[in-house]
């Protein structure tokens, strides 16, 4: 309705004789701002005077008047949207309606707001979930309907009167919709909390009681129970009996129904709070429980071990490992089913009995083939001495031994020749099934155990054999000691360390890797002609004309090896050097000639130098000279000279005559 | 110091004679350590030799085939100068032409002094 | 006629770089292999003759080297002056041919 001031704030707020009020509070004048406000405590309207009537807690008005009581009360609002208010201390006559008359320029309202103030603090409200079973985390809310800036207060939990370890978390509210003042506490509760009282205690500041609320909880779970057997110590032998009962220490709702368990396997037809075992059996040893069940679930006691004691049983050997590998660790153990555990144990190989060895387990730390065969064992505790079982085997494996490589061949094997080898051995577990043979090649096994070498190599020096079952045992290699014509045979320059030049004296050495048997000869020879016998071969003055193809050749008692032919370089300067004249040393003025310095050189001339007949060197530096066109007075000797990186050489002069040609004649 | 001064017309008709002049100080002509030789340059031939005239025991001359038979070199004793002339010009022989100093003794013929050159334009 | 090849026709480089350029002969000239340095609008001027003898006057960052067919001028470190074209010459025989050039510009 448009013709009316809007205004917010909680309907009705509640305190306690000497604490406080803060009215949260927000509104709308119909038009401009608020020129005159007055709270009435229980105002009523006269009709007469066209005014309220009542007590007037505070006042403020144009003129600025207050009455005294405005210490106590205090509007903290303004004029156009604030009209919070605020009585500190408050008292119970405050209790009542309180009336907000306002008033701007042309319009009135008044407001009303109900208070409640009680002589005592009152107390605050517990709020429990419908439902708490245990273990599940619930939150209790404990909630007061109070709230003041000037008036600190503060809420605490308790379980049967002591302060609960859980923190709470608190929270106020002083907002138009609700003033409160709220504590929540996140709780786990368990069985036994079942029937115990939770306060919510409200304190001042100080920590001074004030008032409280309290609650009974109603913790739903799983029946809890308690397992008693007879005898106490759940130990009999074969044929005794045992009487197991089943007590219920608490449960919420009521129990439902009863079972009892062995091995976590339901018993049939046991359905009471007693269970009867008559003549036991070893097999009804186990772990016993009872379970009882209600609408939350079934509740489990405690596990009752149920041990039923017998003489042992026959005997099993388990062998760690078979079949086992010479040298190896084996252990042996004797498994009999016994209650007790067996005390005494003995062992048998091979239907002897193997003295000292009392134990469960016999370890032998290094097996060798002669503990290969049966073994079995007895156990023994109070009640008796069990029966013999059947035993275990042990097979003890190892290589083949004394493994030797045989040459069939007559001696001396020469290269190329045929060699057939076998490789033996003394005995194997398990059997041999293959041989290897070092080192590998394209060779023939005719048969297993046996090796054919066609061709025989050089270099094949010694052969070892291995047979192999699960393992290979190798043999000693033995030495073929192939004989062969000589290897590898190469001219090398001893001298000079450098490249060859004309003069130098020149050393070649035969060189070869090797010869067997030891004892050699040499040859040397150039373009098929035969120089020396020796290993070298020696030039006092090397000459140009020593350069060429060498070989030499090594020999012995199986045959003869030729080098590589070694190319033998003489390095030399510039020699025979001599002009040649193109067309010819006679040219006619006006024509071309072409000068050409030819020579013999080891390395190539790099450059040439040309010279005149008054010995000035002219401006060319490669092998042909061009004069064009030719002058009568380039008539003429000339001389060249060549040089290279092992010296400089000149050539003999070459005269060149230059004639008139007919125009020439004709002038003159 | 050596010098060379170039003299000569920067433009020449085609099909007329080009003249150029190479005055040396500091230098012989006819020094038997020397050569004198005549360079182009245009940007699309690079630099070209040309030729050159020296004197050893005689007067020699060497051209560049590309103007063999329409080039001439002479060397002029008595004025210490060398001159170029080459016949029948066309407008591919607008260059930039340098006379040069060859040095033949420890500099092995490298042109060690230039001349300032001369732009010449062939054109009608 | 005796082809020189110079690479590369080109480069970019800076103040302190080395450089290298590089000249190959179309047949052997033994050591008779000069390198010039030309700016514009001058003549060119003698750095390195005979392939690594330096020209008198010419500053000691210029070096040359080869011999036969493949020669190589270096700057080891690079001065503002030297941005210029470089060019190769051979004095072996005639007729005298130079290379195409290599001009080094500012990075």
């Known amino acids: 309705d448009s013709s009316k001031w809007v205004f917010e704030h909680p309907e009705t707020l509640y305190a306690w004789e000497g604490a406080c009020v803060w009215i949260p509070c927000t509104y709308r004048a119909l038009d401009g701002d608020l020129e005159s406000f007055i709270l009435f405590h229980n105002p009523e309207y006269n009709k007469n005077t066209s005014k309220f009537d009542g007590t007037r807690l505070y006042e403020s008005t144009k003129d600025g008047k207050v009455p005294s009581e405005q210490k106590r009360v205090q509007f903290l609002g303004d004029k156009n949207k604030n009209c919070t208010l605020s009585i500190h201390p408050v008292h119970l006559n405050d209790s009542g309606q309180l009336g907000l008359r306002m008033e701007s320029k042309t319009e009135k309202w008044m407001e009303r707001i109900h208070l409640n103030v009680s002589e005592r603090p009152f107390p605050p409200h517990i709020q429990l979930p419908p439902e708490i079973q245990e273990s599940q985390e619930v939150t209790l809310t404990c909630l007061l309907n109070f709230s003041c800036y000037g008036y600190p207060i503060q809420l605490q939990w308790l379980l049967e009167g002591v302060p609960m370890r859980q923190a709470a978390v608190t929270s106020t509210s002083l907002t138009i919709k609700s003033v409160f003042t709220r504590s929540e506490l996140k709780f786990s509760p368990q069985w036994s909390h079942h029937g115990k009282i939770v306060t919510c205690q409200l304190q001042d500041a100080d920590g001074k009681f004030l008032s409280n609320d309290t609650v009974q909880l109603n913790v739903k779970h799983t029946p809890k129970l308690e397992i008693k057997v007879t005898p106490s110590d759940a130990i009999v032998r074969e044929g005794d009996s045992v009487t197991m009962t089943c007590e219920v220490s608490s449960s919420n709702p009521e129990y439902t129904t009863v079972s009892w368990l062995k091995d976590g396997t339901s018993l049939k037809k046991q359905n009471t709070f007693t269970l009867n075992l008559r003549e036991v059996t070893k097999d009804q040893s186990g772990k016993y429980c009872c379970q009882v069940s209600n609408d939350v679930g079934p509740g489990r006691s405690e596990e009752v071990f149920l041990q039923v004691q017998y003489a042992p049983e026959p005997s099993t050997v388990q062998i760690l490992h078979s079949p086992a590998v010479e040298g190896s660790q084996v252990e042996f153990l004797c498994m009999s089913l016994a209650n007790p555990l067996p005390t005494n144990y003995t062992w048998y190989h091979n239907g002897k009995e193997m003295q000292g060895r009392t134990e469960e387990k016999v370890h032998i730390p290094k097996i060798l083939p002669w503990h290969a065969g049966t073994y079995s064992c007895v156990a023994e505790n109070i009640l008796g001495t069990g029966q013999r079982g059947p035993g275990a085997e042990l097979d003890v494996q190892y290589p083949p031994k004394k493994v030797t490589t045989v040459i069939q061949n007559p001696m001396p094997i020469r290269e190329g020749d045929t060699v057939t080898l076998s490789c033996n051995y003394n005995s194997s577990n398990p059997s041999v099934t293959r041989y290897e043979w070092k080192p590998h090649g394209a060779w023939e096994e005719p048969s297993l155990g046996v090796l054919k070498i066609q061709n025989v190599g050089w270099d094949n020096t010694t052969i070892a054999c291995a047979a192999c079952n699960s393992w290979c045992s190798w043999a000693s290699p033995v030495a073929l000691n192939v004989q062969y014509a000589p290897r590898d045979v190469r001219v090398r320059k001893i001298k000079p360390l450098s490249e060859i030049h004309s003069g130098n004296s020149v050393s070649l050495q035969c060189d070869f890797s090797s010869s067997h048997p030891k004892e050699v000869q040499f040859f040397w020879e150039k373009n098929g002609r035969l120089l020396g016998k020796e290993s070298q071969l020696n030039f006092d003055s090397i000459s140009p004309e020593d350069a060429g193809s060498y070989s030499c050749w090594v020999n012995n008692s199986i045959g003869q090896t030729a080098s590589k032919a070694w190319t033998l370089e003489v390095l030399y300067a510039p020699r025979r050097l001599r002009v040649s004249m193109s067309p010819g040393d006679q040219v006619m003025e006006g024509k071309s000639a072409t000068l050409t310095c030819e020579s013999d050189a080891n390395p190539p001339v790099s450059h040439y130098t040309w010279f005149d007949w008054n010995n000035q060197s002219l401006p060319y530096h490669s092998q042909k000279l061009r004069l064009e066109p030719v002058k009568v007075q380039h008539s003429g000797a000339y001389w060249c000279q060549g040089t290279n990186s092992v010296g400089k050489g000149r050539s003999p002069l070459s005269t060149l005559t230059v004639y008139y040609s007919p125009e020439t004649i004709g002038r003159r | 110091q050596v010098q060379l001064q170039q003299s000569g017309p920067g433009l020449v008709k085609p099909s007329q004679t080009l003249s150029l002049t190479c005055a040396i100080s500091g230098d012989s002509v006819s020094g038997n350590r020397a050569t004198w030789n005549w360079i182009r340059q245009s940007p699309s031939r690079g630099l070209e030799w040309l030729g050159r005239t020296y004197y050893r025991s005689a007067w020699y001359n060497d051209y560049a085939v590309s103007v063999k038979g329409r080039i001439t070199f002479n060397p002029d004793t008595s004025k210490n100068q060398f001159s170029l002339q080459l016949n029948s010009v066309t407008p591919e022989d607008t260059a930039v032409y340098y006379c040069?100093?060859?040095?033949?003794?420890?500099?092995?013929?490298?042109?060690?002094?230039w001349g300032q050159g001369t732009t010449v334009t062939v054109s009608g | 006629d005796i082809q020189l090849t110079q690479s590369p026709p080109s480069l970019s480089a800076s103040v302190g770089d080395r450089v290298t350029i590089t000249c190959r002969a179309s047949?052997?000239?033994?050591?008779?292999l000069n390198w010039y340095q030309q700016k514009p609008g001058k003549a060119p001027k003698l750095l390195i003759y005979?392939?690594?003898s330096l020209q008198s006057g010419v500053p000691s960052r210029f070096s040359g080297s080869g011999f036969g067919t493949d020669f190589t001028l270096t700057i080891s470190s690079l001065q503002p002056e030297d941005f210029a074209t470089y060019y190769c010459?051979?004095?072996?025989?005639?007729?005298?041919?130079f290379g195409q050039g290599t001009k080094v510009d500012i990075k």
């Open positions: 040069a100093r060859g040095e033949s003794g420890a500099a092995a013929d490298a042109f060690d002094i």
């Open positions: 005979a392939a690594s």
């Open positions: 047949q052997s000239i033994s050591s008779y």
């Open positions: 010459q051979q004095s072996y025989s005639t007729p005298q041919t």
